[in-house]
Amino acid sequence: IWSAVFLNSLFNQEVQIPLTESYCGPCPKNWICYKNNCYQFFDESKNWYESQASCMSQNASLLKVYSKEDQDLLKLVKSYHWMGLVHIPTNGSWQWEDGSILSPNLLTIIEMQKGDCALYASSFKGYIENCSTPNTYICMQRTV
């Protein structure tokens, strides 16, 4: 079980996550399992492409937000982390790594500067950043 210290370094307040519940998993060792998703927060800073490669090397992808209900623990995430959302300049849409389009009412997109990659921030915010800027990142693996 993850220590409270570890969780407090990731979240804005103490988060109760039933890490050992039988319905959740399997996940890679030391990953957080929550509502049939595995999450890992990596605190080394990489650009978006390196972050994507790191997740892929662990048989995962960068964070995909698909449900505020199933992913409610993300409400409390501290700081900014790369997620798997990129801007498609040709049609102006936002697309996940798997090619699916961002559904409305999942994220609030905030463009701070010109960029095509998105950082996840608490309460379902996506801050747009230059893809070559180093940042921490979140990997995710679906268990079902």
């Epitope: 804005n12 409400k75 102006g92 936002w94 961002l102 409305p104 009412n105 994220l107 609030t108 997109i109 905030i110 463009e111 701070m112 500067q113 921030a121 608490s122 309460s123 915010k125």
Partner: antibody, heavy 122, light 107 residues
Framework: QVQLVQSGAEVKKPGASVKVSCKAS????????MHWVRQAPGQGLEWMGE????????NYAQKFQGRVTMTRDTSTSTVYMELSSLRSEDTAVYYC???????????????WGQGTTVTVSS | YIQMTQSPSSLSASVGDRVTITCRSS??????LNWYQQKPGKAPKLLIY???RLHSGVPSRFSGSGSGTDFTFTISSLQPEDIATYYC?????????FGGGTKVEIK
């Protein structure tokens, strides 16, 4: 109906701080960002920043970075804007305004407070 | 940051006239352009959001069009109560920025 009610006029000395409040009603407070916009006498509108009342995330205009602090109290559905190190150029009417969200972007302001006049004078 | 250039800065027209104000952004802002009306001593009011959508309760004589960097605001038939200053504002990128305003007067 949506209402934003701001605190009363303030007179401050240079170097002091001012804290303006904006009490929201008629909608779910934590579902909408709140902006702060100011208007100096005879001048246009100037965006100062915005706050997401569902948490403590803020975005400030670079011009005000380090001098402005936006906070909120969810128990009273009130947002606050504090501006420090006041100078005469900060004399203005300060408005809070609720953000419009289209499912992707918060891009405009649909309801505005009545404004709070802040006068900075020695 | 994105600069919003509004023109003209002031205009005078007769009741019933068609009035047009333009707003140009220094970068592509898609359709994230809003128009506000401000009467002297009052708070601004949203008239049009997302380039062309009329805010609730706003008369249909107000309209907006454009995309990318060039936008237009139109009052199809100017009324005495339309005397005000009108502002455009972009909401695509931080910081949110306003045009300098257009003061509309009756001849």
């Amino acid at each position: 109906q949506v209402q934003l009610v701001q605190s009363g006029a303030e007179v401050k000395k240079p170097g002091a701080s001012v804290k303006v409040s904006c009490k929201a009603s008629g909608y779910t407070f934590t579902n909408y960002w709140m902006h702060w916009v100011r208007q100096a006498p005879g001048q246009g509108l100037e965006w100062m920043g915005e706050i997401d009342p569902s948490d403590i995330y803020t975005n400030y205009a670079q011009k005000f970075q380090g001098r402005v602090t936006m906070t909120r109290d969810t128990s009273t559905s009130t947002v606050y804007m504090e501006l420090s190190s006041l100078r005469s150029e900060d004399t203005a009417v300060y408005y809070c305004a609720r953000g419009i969200y289209d499912g992707y972007y918060v891009y405009g302001m649909d309801y505005w407070g009545q404004g709070t006049t802040v006068t900075v004078s020695s | 940051y994105i600069q919003m250039t509004q023109s003209p800065s002031s205009l005078s027209a007769s009741v019933g006239d068609r009035v047009t104000i333009t707003c140009r952004s220094s970068q592509d802002i898609s359709n994230y352009l809003n128009w506000y009306q401000q009467k002297p001593g009052k708070a601004p009011k949203l008239l049009i959001y997302y380039t062309s959508r009329l805010h609730s309760g706003v008369p249909s004589r107000f309209s907006g069009s454009g995309s990318g960097t060039d936008f237009t605001f139109t009052i199809s038939s100017l009324q005495p109560e339309d005397i005000a200053t009108y502002y455009c504002q972009q909401g695509k990128t931080l910081p949110r920025t306003f045009g300098g305003g257009t003061k509309v007067e009756i001849k």
